[in-house]
């Protein structure tokens, strides 16, 4: 029951996280700044991964995609890549985890298969969350670095003077959405990995082994080849071994009262 709850909760948390990563990637408010200010009007700017928008105090708003821009920062492309990889991995993880859920029965899928799928989706969620956190952090670092580098300087350009303007900038809402969403996806992935341990079958069955008594009417119990079941008298998992022990594949089975499989 606890395993099902952990798995289910991990799935829900990851689902919310991935939805958040998608939302953050699409949002325009990755960074915000005041571009222009005078006593009558103010021009406020907010930028996303795909476009930049200006909003004036008069209500006028205009957004423009970056495809018109030649010199996009390489870091921006890296952030885009990280966020997209995060979304893709998260989406695949969600798809895998749906089939892995203990509460959903699909044919005669064994618990071991579900455990493997749960682990796979968990790892995918962890990587997805890390990608999102890394992407958002790289963007935040790029913002801080760029603004420190471009503090009010004036130089002569073609046709006159060029002056970099000191503006107040802030981290946009998308950064915080991305950090939280990445964290949730990461937590969800960890929960899925924890659930996987509980889903794994308790006993590991190895190849069945035939034992042949060497001359004496002594029965050898194969308890040692079942892990922690307490099967037979061999409860301490000590191998009961006999020189005549051979795997089922090797032995030519002749009917005998001493054969135990």
């Amino acid at each position: 029951m606890a395993v099902t709850a952990c798995q289910g909760l991990g799935f829900v948390v990851s689902l919310i996280g991935i939805a958040g990563i998608i939302a953050a990637t699409c949002m325009d408010q990755w960074s915000t700044q005041d571009l222009y200010n005078n006593p009558v009007t103010a021009v406020f700017n907010y930028q996303g991964l795909w476009r930049s928008c200006v909003r004036e105090s008069s209500g006028f708003t205009e957004c423009r995609g970056y495809f018109t821009l030649l010199g996009l920062p390489a870091m921006l492309q890296a952030v885009r890549a990280l966020m997209i990889v995060g979304i893709v991995l998260g989406a695949i993880g969600l798809l895998v985890s749906i089939f892995a859920l203990k509460c959903i029965r699909i044919g005669s899928m064994e618990d071991s298969a579900k455990a493997n799928m749960t682990l796979t989706s968990g790892i995918m969620f962890i990587v997805s969350g890390l990608c999102a956190i890394a992407g958002v952090s790289v963007f935040a670092n790029m913002l801080v670095t760029n603004f420190w580098m471009s503090t009010a300087n004036m130089y002569t350009g073609m046709g006159g003077m060029v002056q970099t303007v000191q503006t107040r900038y802030t981290f946009g809402a998308a950064l915080f959405v991305g950090w939280v969403a990445g964290g949730l996806t990461l937590i969800g992935g960890v929960m899925m990995c924890i659930a996987c341990r509980g889903l794994a079958p308790e006993e590991t069955n190895y190849k069945a082994v035939s034992y042949h008594a060497s001359g004496h009417s002594v029965a050898y119990k194969p308890g040692g080849f079942k892990a922690s079941t307490g099967f037979g008298s061999n409860t301490k998992n000590k191998k009961i071994y006999d020189g005549g022990a051979r795997t089922e594949d090797e032995v030519q089975s002749y009917p005998s009262k001493h054969d135990y499989v």
């Epitope: 930049s52 004036e56 105090s57 209500g59 821009l69 471009s150 046709g159």
Partner: nanobody, 120 residues
Framework: EVQLVESGGGLVQPGGSLRLSCAAS????????MGWYRQAPGKGRELVAT???????YYADSMKGRSTISRDNAKNTVYLQMNSLKPEDTAVYYC??????????????WGQGTLVTVSS
């Protein structure tokens, strides 16, 4: 890089009119605001009028009611119509363009200036 070409300056009699124009060209992302500043001999640079991309205008008290700023977004051009000119309006008029630079602070570009002389 943005190139600014100013035109329309010259000698005008008091009470006369003049229309200044400034065209921006080059490669840039987006012009946020355009405006005109002036610098009289021996004085500092002062704002005359500005206009934002959305069309919001702002005028200095000295030019209120006597000037009209307008812009053509498609041509990236700003115009300043000045009427009832006075001798104290004599100055070098500079075109100013504020350009948005994605993920960085915006840049202000200044023209070379055009001289307006109000004299009889």
């Amino acid at each position: 890089e943005v190139q600014l070409v100013e035109s329309g300056g010259g000698l005008v009699q008091p009470g006369g009119s003049l229309r200044l124009s400034c065209a921006a060209s080059g490669s840039f992302f987006r012009i946020v605001a355009m405006g005109w500043y002036r610098q009289a001999p021996g004085k500092g640079r002062e704002l005359v009028a500005t206009i934002t991309r959305g069309g919001s205008t702002y005028y200095a008290d000295s030019m209120k009611g006597r000037s009209t700023i307008s812009r053509d977004n498609a041509k990236n051009t700003v115009y300043l119509q000045m009427n009832s000119l006075k001798p104290e309006d004599t100055a070098v008029y500079y075109c100013n363009v504020r350009v948005e630079v994605p993920f960085m602070a915006p840049n202000d570009y200044w023209g070379q200036g055009t001289l307006v002389t109000v004299s009889s």
